[in-house]
């Protein structure tokens, strides 16, 4: 069963007289491990034998027999998968058939191996794109069909037999499938490299030559060119004459066409090599150039520029930038058509020359609005001076000058009157379109730049506008300076710190925030009734008979402001204590009786205690003594004792007196 | 060990025939080649005749193809030659081999190639 063997090798291998020679190999074997191999040269089989004849190059065998020229060829493989070879050195009379006799343990197979040894180094073989196009990237290959581990190769690209500059990538392949040695060069030919020769040479380690190929590059490029001029520096004045010639220098294929060139774009009706310009006009100033194509494309010449002198034309005059701010730099550039250029200029200002300016710009560095106006200016050149042109207008432009905020109202201005106020300006460019106002309120502007305020506010302090075009330019504050009455008005009590205990010395202050003008007067009163003119009201010793309710009142010139009223409250113990008898101090026994202890007192009374003639307390705190039923006993003189905060106060002594009932005379 | 045992050689006459047969013991492997070879005196060994055990192919010399015949009984392990039209050049010790399947590349030899198991021989005669 021939499937049952899988060998996998390059068919041929290539070599040179004492080289070496490396096989891949790669086998399977179904049925078991190698038992034995030989490798023969040349095998013939003879079929009367039934032997193969030919030289054993290797014998690997199960007695381990191994001939002499093992040491030169080597078995690398193993038992059961690998199989690879190696001669070193090869001769040229290993040239031919190498045969590998191997056996397993149920079968023995042949397999043949191609051998290629020449006498000498064999070339290598440059390989090139199909087409070869200038500035384009190709990759040139070196292929040489060999390699082997113990005979280190070098391939070197040459060009003209000088080494070129471009690094190579060399490669090197020794697989089952190929055997080989590349080496790529990638490389961007130029025209220049047309018909040049390329050489690969193959060198030993040492760099020896051992072998090369060579190639001529045909390298496809469109028209190299050549221009001539005359006059060769392409200088001429206005009806002159000129002629350019063009010539190939190089052309891959030959080329086709013929055209010529201005400024880009073609020139119709010339078709020849040469181009004749007769009484040149200034119009034809500009790049020229002569164009031939081929089957790659067309190929221009360098660019001849041809320049037509004359004089400056009428000069235009171009503003960087316009309008423009004040304090910003602006740049005047004289433009006119010349050719030469303008070697001298002449700068106006509103028609009069600005002095010491010949330069084609003008610059200023800081802009204010008197440099506003009309600009123009004149070119010279050494063929002539030209026309002033028509000039260019510079417009300045700045904030609002010089705001003021001005008080339309006869002074001084009082709380709650219509303030009339208007903001006023010296100039401005542009025109001013709105005003603002600080601070902010909720005012009329009954025309623009003119500010109502109604029923103005006794704080109104300071009030500014401003003037606004592209910017707002603010005035100076201006007081308003509004007079009114005083404000928060109110009675403070300086002294005692404390509550008010009768008989102290207390002050009393009129205390107000603000008034405008200063100058005020003092009022106190006290229901009604005027006490006082000064800031201050004084009691040396304070008497319950001066409590009440007090108010005091400030006054300017422009009105009086009264305070809220303030209760003075005066603390003082128990007084006028008197014991009533309700319902007479004479009262019929079984009867009730009820004893109640008035006093005056702040604050009131908190605690009673109630005495009988004998002084001595009885057990009631209430302001009322009921006794009920009454009795005879009950006769006698009663007072009482009050006592609050402050102190105690005691009553005079008042007499009840029980009388006995018809009842009990009748029972006597 | 691969043992190998000719019989049937003798003595006749030109034109008599002989069938020899040998028998395998000791081969491990159910694909063989087997084949008849000979060697006259003073001459290189050469194959007469060989047979293939897997398919059966056969192989005949030119000089005897036509008058002998070989067969192979895979039960026993037995190869045959039948010698027909016996000529005094047959003369020669007759020996067995067998051995394993060699394959060069894809081509399968019918005759035991390099083979090491031998016969002990018989000698077969044509003489008048």
């Known amino acids: 069963d021939s499937s049952k063997w899988v060998f996998e090798h390059p068919e041929t291998l290539y070599a040179w007289e004492g080289a070496c020679v490396w096989i891949p190999c790669t086998y399977r074997a179904l049925d078991g491990d190698l038992e034995s191999f030989i490798l023969f040269h040349n095998p013939e089989y003879n079929k009367n034998t039934s032997k193969f004849d030919g030289t054993r190059l290797y014998e690997s065998t199960k007695d381990g027999k191994v001939p002499s020229e093992q040491k030169r060829v080597q078995f690398l493989g193993d038992k059961n998968k690998n199989c690879t070879l190696s001669i070193h050195p090869v001769h040229l009379n290993d040239s031919g058939q190498l045969g590998l006799r191997m056996e397993s343990k149920t079968e023995k197979w042949m397999e043949r191996i191609h051998l290629n040894v020449s006498e000498r180094p064999f070339p290598p073989h440059i390989q090139l794109p199909p087409e070869i196009q200038e500035s384009q990237e190709v990759t040139l290959t070196c292929l040489l069909n060999f390699s082997c581990y113990g005979y280190p190769i070098q391939l070197q690209w040459l060009l003209e037999g000088v080494p070129m500059r471009q690094a190579a990538v060399t490669s090197t392949s020794l697989t089952i499938k190929s055997v080989f040695t590349r080496s790529e060069l990638k490389f961007s030919p130029q025209w220049s490299h047309h018909g040049k020769i390329v050489t690969c040479q193959l060198q030993d380690a040492d760099g020896k030559f051992l072998s090369n190929d060579t190639v001529q590059l045909n390298v496809k490029h469109t028209p190299k060119l050549e221009i001539k001029v005359t006059p060769s520096d392409a200088i001429v004045r206005e009806g002159d004459s000129v002629t350019m010639t063009c010539e190939v220098s190089s052309s891959n294929p030959e080329y086709t066409t013929v055209s010529w060139l201005k400024d880009g774009t073609s020139l119709k009706k010339q078709n020849t090599f040469t181009l004749n310009l007769r009484e040149v006009t200034k119009d034809q100033s500009g790049k020229y150039c002569c164009q031939v194509s081929n089957d790659v494309g067309p190929g221009r010449s360098e660019e001849v520029f041809l320049q037509v002198q004359y004089a400056p034309e009428p000069s235009t005059v171009q503003i960087l930038h316009s309008p423009a701010v004040e304090g910003s730099q602006v740049e005047f550039l004289c433009m006119s058509l010349a050719n030469p250029l303008p070697t001298n200029y002449t700068w106006y200002h509103n028609g009069k020359e600005m002095q010491g300016r010949t330069e084609e710009k003008v610059h200023i560095p800081k802009i204010l609005p008197w440099h506003a106006g009309t600009y123009s200016c004149v070119a010279e050149n050494i063929l002539g001076t030209g026309q002033r042109g028509p000039g260019a207008e510079l417009d300045v432009q700045y904030p609002p000058k010089k705001v003021t905020t001005v008080i339309q109202n006869p002074m001084p201005i009082r709380e709650g009157d219509t303030v009339t106020l208007s903001c006023n300006y010296n100039s401005s460019n542009p025109s001013v379109t709105r005003y603002e106002w600080k601070p902010h309120g909720a005012w009329e502007e009954p025309s623009l730049g003119v500010l109502k305020i109604q029923n103005v506010g006794w704080d109104n302090t300071t009030i500014a506008c401003a003037a606004c075009n592209s910017w707002c330019s603010w005035a100076s504050p201006v007081a308003l300076n509004v007079q009114y009455a005083p404000r928060d008005v109110r009675v403070r009590k300086i002294k005692p710190l404390s509550e008010i205990h009768s008989g102290n010395s207390v002050s009393l202050q009129c205390d107000f925030s603000s008034s405008h003008p200063k100058e005020v007067q003092f009022f106190w009163e006290k229901n009604g009734r005027l006490l006082g003119k000064e800031s201050q009201l004084n009691f040396d010793s304070i008497s319950p008979e001066d409590a009440g309710s007090y108010s005091c009142w400030v006054n300017n010139s422009i009105g009086q402001t009264a305070s809220k009223a303030w209760t003075l409250e005066v603390l003082y113990a128990p007084r006028r204590l008197r014991v009533s008898m309700s319902p007479g101090d004479q009262v019929m026994e079984g009867k009730s009786a009820t004893l109640t202890c008035e006093s005056d007192a702040n604050p009131p009374v908190s605690h009673y205690t109630w005495f009988d003639w004998n002084n001595q307390s009885l057990p009631y705190h209430s302001q009322k003594l009921r006794l009920e039923p009454v009795k005879v006993q009950h006769s006698g003189a009663y007072w009482c004792q009050g006592t609050n905060s402050v102190g105690k106060g005691r009553s005079p002594l008042s007499t009840l007196t029980v009388y006995y009932s018809p009842e009990t005379i009748g029972r006597r | 060990q691969v043992q190998l045992v000719e019989s049937g050689g003798g003595l006749v006459q030109p034109g008599d025939s002989l069938r020899l047969s040998c028998t395998v013991s000791g081969f491990t492997s159910d694909y063989y080649a087997m084949g008849w070879f000979r060697q006259a005196p003073g001459k290189e060994r050469e194959a007469v005749s060989c047979i293939s055990s897997s398919d059966g192919v056969t192989y005949y010399a030119d000089s005897v193809r036509g008058r002998f015949t070989i067969s192979r009984d895979n039960a026993k392990n037995t190869v045959y030659l039948e010698m027909n039209s016996l000529k005094p050049e047959d003369t020669a010790i007759y020996y067995c081999?067998?051995?394993?399947?060699?394959?060069?590349?894809?081509?399968?030899?019918?005759?035991?190639?390099?083979?090491?198991?031998w016969g002990q021989g018989t000698q077969v005669t044509v003489s008048s």
């Open positions: 081999a067998v051995d394993k399947p060699f394959y060069d590349g894809g081509y399968l030899y019918t005759c035991p190639v390099d083979f090491d198991s």
